[in-house]
Interface confidence: low
Amino acid sequence: EPPGPEQRVVRRAAEVPGPEPSQQEQVAFGSGDTVELSCHPPGGAPTGPTVWAKDGTGLVASHRILVGPQRLQVLNASHEDAGVYSCQHRLTRRVLCHFSVRVTDAPSSGDDEDGEDVAEDTGAPYWTRPERMDKKLLAVPAANTVRFRCPAAGNPTPSISWLKNGKEFRGEHRIGGIKLRHQQWSLVMESVVPSDRGNYTCVVENKFGSIRQTYTLDVLERSPHRPILQAGLPANQTAILGSDVEFHCKVYSDAQPHIQWLKHVEVNGSKVGPDGTPYVTVLKTAGANTTDKELEVLSLHNVTFEDAGEYTCLAGNSIGFSHHSAWLVVLPAEEELMETDEAGSVYAG
């Protein structure tokens, strides 16, 4: 009975090579797939008796593993079925075909190769979705989500990496980070800002070759405004004496923001100056080697009672400033708490 759509049969075939064992063919199947590995001699010439092995050990047929002379079937594939499969000549032990099998969580999307399409995907990468790559210039309003896609294939399955203006591009290079969806050959940037403008290049490569595609992103300015801070951040924290604490602040800004972390302090018993401005000390500010990502987090190590109090994330740009504050409460260590309790004191946090 043929499997239903949710349990696809995925076939992979390799040509029998000359005297040298074939290049190991990398293949990926989805969990639950019925896997077929075929070893076809050119022109249909008989290969003689063959055996199949997995990771060097001969495979024995079972209710789930069906072994034929030039074909191996594994039903309902699972992660344990991943490994190196080889089809060998039974007498000479010459390797006729070599497969490196990966089993992923998702069921395969059914690239169901027929016999006549043998190994058609072997070799250098190529674009599989040309019509989705026509739009090379993308102009989007600020705060929108942008997705660049470079759907490709090849054998072995190629890797994809991204460049921005010719340099390696990683999540820490922008506020809000990036999403790399390798399964979908895509780069996603949420809440784009003008500093995201530039040329984005996907580089798709395997050992047989490399292809690339460059997209140009233009971010259209909205009416300028001061930085926007994500609601609820930083959040109030309660910590035990001697523990570590992190405050987070998420900043969205069209113009390049300047981020500082401040702690509110008292001067001569007063929290504010004569003009009503709070007394603060700057704990963290942009330096030569500080990334925006690093500035979005304030880390306090081995906190003391002196660390308790009000902390502010201040973000400014050419238009103005925004700030959010949070409180840190420091509790005594458990032993101290027990001692105070026994003395009959009440601690109000």
Partner: antibody, heavy 120, light 112 residues
Framework: QVQLVQSGAEVKKPGASVKVSCKAS????????IHWVRQAPGQGLEWIGD????????SYAQKFQGRATLTADRSTSTAYMELSSLRSEDTAVYYC?????????????WGQGTLVTVSS | DIVMTQSPDSLAVSLGERATINCKSS????????????LAWYQQKPGQSPKLLIY???TRESGVPDRFSGSGSGTDFTLTISSVQAEDVAVYYC????????FGGGTKVEIK
Amino acid sequence: QVQLVQSGAEVKKPGASVKVSCKASGDTFTDFEIHWVRQAPGQGLEWIGDIDPETGSTSYAQKFQGRATLTADRSTSTAYMELSSLRSEDTAVYYCTRTYDGYPYAMDYWGQGTLVTVSS
Amino acid sequence: DIVMTQSPDSLAVSLGERATINCKSSQSVLYSNNNKNYLAWYQQKPGQSPKLLIYWASTRESGVPDRFSGSGSGTDFTLTISSVQAEDVAVYYCQQYYSYRTFGGGTKVEIK
């Protein structure tokens, strides 16, 4: 098992709008594109457009540009097709269907269809 | 837009006979980089949603009987049912997915 479940039949007057929904289950909604195809009684299949639920980016057949609006709600894994300024020739079964973001890019799963009748 | 033209409009065949449906695209749907034809075939039985039969012009979707086969390249394609069964009575559509999506007009297959 992937399923695309569409909203029920609609009867509309000419000039009105209709909004058909398509709820996806059994797979990651943002891993595929949702397409809308219609079929007038006794006629062939006609592609309306598609939406990428990840970003909301859409493409439309020229004929439907400006009259059809495709949207997607990632939180409920539901896609919507709204057709405005309805006329009698819009009477058709409207299907949602999907194409995977990997192979094979053909429409491998289809909804059951929603009959939209435009009549005064 | 790429226009897809199917022929014939309808086809009456005896059980067990061969049925051949043709599809022509107004421009090539073959992508030279991967040598794949961006063409699919669908089957629609009366009162049902369409069902994917063939993609990449010649690759059968899983679960589709092997009496269905697709061939052709560039602009000319053929769907062949090698031995028509009663359950094959349906309308068959070709569709290109090289540039957006367009369908052929459909071919109705009936039993003589």
